[in-house]
Amino acid sequence: MSANATLKPLCPILEQMSRLQSHSNTSIRYIDHAAVLLHGLASLLGLVENGVILFVVGCRMRQTVVTTWVLHLALSDLLASASLPFFTYFLAVGHSWELGTTFCKLHSSIFFLNMFASGFLLSAISLDRCLQVVRPVWAQNHRTVAAAHKVCLVLWALAVLNTVPYFVFRDTISRLDGRIMCYYNVLLLNPGPDRDATCNSRQVALAVSKFLLAFLVPLAIIASSHAAVSLRLQHRGRRRPGRFVRLVAAVVAAFALCWGPYHVFSLLEARAHANPGLRPLVWRGLPFVTSLAFFNSVANPVLYVLTCPDMLRKLRRSLRTVLESVLVDDSELGGAGSSRRRRTSSTARSASPLALCSRPEEPRGPARLLGWLLGSCAASPQTGPLNRALSSTSS
């Protein structure tokens, strides 16, 4: 196309980004192929893992406040994982967005929605735990699954609200070499007379606000909640941290490690408007740290399983149930009473009031993972939702 590549007004950093060309260097091409492979694998893993977590926590576990938090975190991660295949396609076609402006806006919005939702939900989890320890009587009376769902809905609404500017200012921009960028274009709406000033102020506002709201404030809430809980538990003489504490700690650590670099580069990018010398650094680093932020959604389900033995047990049973229901022979449907009795007993056990992370009867760590992978034929199968519902009414 021999049209002007940039008919709409663009910020200087975008104009210069449009000059950058795809590489013909062979070693860089190999990195590209590896990146496509890695992102493709992450897409698949993220979708499967978060889907399984949603299924296990939502359908195979007794609903508690804790499972509600995990359910919503997994939902946020599933959304992000669902957008990852499109990012993989962007990489596969040579770093060019071929899916149109509307989908560019939607895809980017999902990334930012996940960013805000994760930060807000982790803050809520920490505050919830803090209230349990600092205000136990109040928590006893007000901590219900319904209340947790309501809080989550409010947090999702806030996350959506914070994502709106990223939807509005996302655009497709043609590069000089013919590739298409899906990137910020802060001059899309009311550019004003001073283009440079508008570019600078808006980019800084976006970068600083997302750093504060989606990273610094959540981490501050998490840290202060943890400090308050630690102080209170010290007075009570508690020593070892509970399993749920370890789960939260792992998820928070992953959140900080995966999103921290992204926010650093996002702030550098905002500075690069006024300081062109930062541009090459930003252009080099931003794709990597964005991928790292995406991978947070793939890491979380692994952390739930690794830090939570009961989750692993439920997961194993659920997978066996799915396999059994698929592989079951017609003649076995009206099978012997002994098998029916065995199922009922397992149902009663599954319906017992279990939190997300109860004490396991199984080995921990790598041995547990290995055991799960190899499978334990002796373990009793999990019942379907109908049987569970019926048995729970009698219990």
Epitope: M1, S22, R175, D177
Partner: antibody, heavy 122, light 107 residues
Framework: QVQLQQSGTGLVRPGTSVRVSCKAS????????IEWIKQRPGQGLEWIGV????????HYNEKFKGKATLTADTSSSTAYMQLSSLTSGDSAVYFC???????????????WGQGTSVTVSS | DIQMTQSPSSLSASLGERVSLTCRAS??????FSWLQQKPDGTIKRLIY???TLDSGVPKRFSGSRSGSDYSLTISSLESEDFADYYC?????????FGGGTKLEIK
């Protein structure tokens, strides 16, 4: 070696158009950008715009939008600049120059053509 | 647009003399800056890019430096072929802009 060979001097009438050519040799034409620059007699240099020969995408200085049209023919490794509705103010020497970029950085105008003098006179 | 203010506009110097030309950018350009030489026959050659990197084939007597928004071109010992017009160029932001030029003449 890298060379940019421009077309010869042109004497044109006001209101008409002129096309200046810039033939590249000694490098892969489609992997570099071609910039166009104007120099009025006894004056400084002014950037007109840039074209990517591989895609045909271009970017113009606001001042030259509607005046200059940049094109490229990859088969002959030649870049063109068409100047329309010529006035005496368009009388100048026009240069083409090569610029490069990588995935992460760019540089400007490492090799220049010898210039094409365009005189607009009735 | 970024303004490039070049000084002096003309300079007379003798062979073997050391001379410096300066260019000031109206905005931060972070070294996206070049020095160009235009010979009396009109041909243009880039001498320096990225504020201080010498182009291949350019004699070592030419050097570029930067101090904040001020950029300098120094010729340590003038030779006869150095008498020409010199222009600075910023390529940080569109539209790329040039300095007004410095005419270097033999004293």
């Amino acid at each position: 070696q890298v060379q940019l060979q421009q077309s010869g001097t042109g004497l044109v009438r006001p209101g008409t158009s002129v096309r200046v050519s810039c033939k590249a040799s000694g490098y892969a034409f489609i992997t570099y950008l071609i910039e166009w620059i104007k120099q009025r007699p006894g004056q400084g240099l002014e950037w007109i715009g840039v074209i990517h020969p591989g895609s045909g995408n271009s970017h113009y200085n606001e001042k030259f939008k509607g005046k200059a049209t940049l094109t490229a023919d990859t088969s002959s490794s030649t870049a063109y600049m068409q100047l329309s509705s010529l006035t005496s103010g368009d009388s100048a020497v026009y240069f083409c120059a090569r610029s490069g970029s990588s995935s992460f950085d760019y540089y400007a105008m490492d090799f220049w053509g010898q210039g094409t003098s365009v005189t607009v006179s009735s | 647009d970024i303004q490039m203010t070049q000084s002096p506009s003309s300079l007379s110097a003798s062979l073997g003399e050391r001379v410096s030309l300066t260019c000031r950018a109206s905005q931060e350009i972070s070294g996206y800056f070049s020095w160009l030489q235009q010979k009396p026959d009109g041909t243009i050659k880039r001498l320096i890019y990225a504020a201080s990197t010498l182009d291949s084939g350019v004699p070592k007597r030419f050097s570029g430096s930067r101090s904040g928004s001020d950029y300098s071109l120094t010729i340590s010992s003038l030779e006869s072929e150095d008498f020409a017009d010199y222009y600075c160029l910023q390529y940080a932001n569109y539209p790329y802009t040039f300095g007004g030029g410095t005419k270097l003449e033999i004293k």
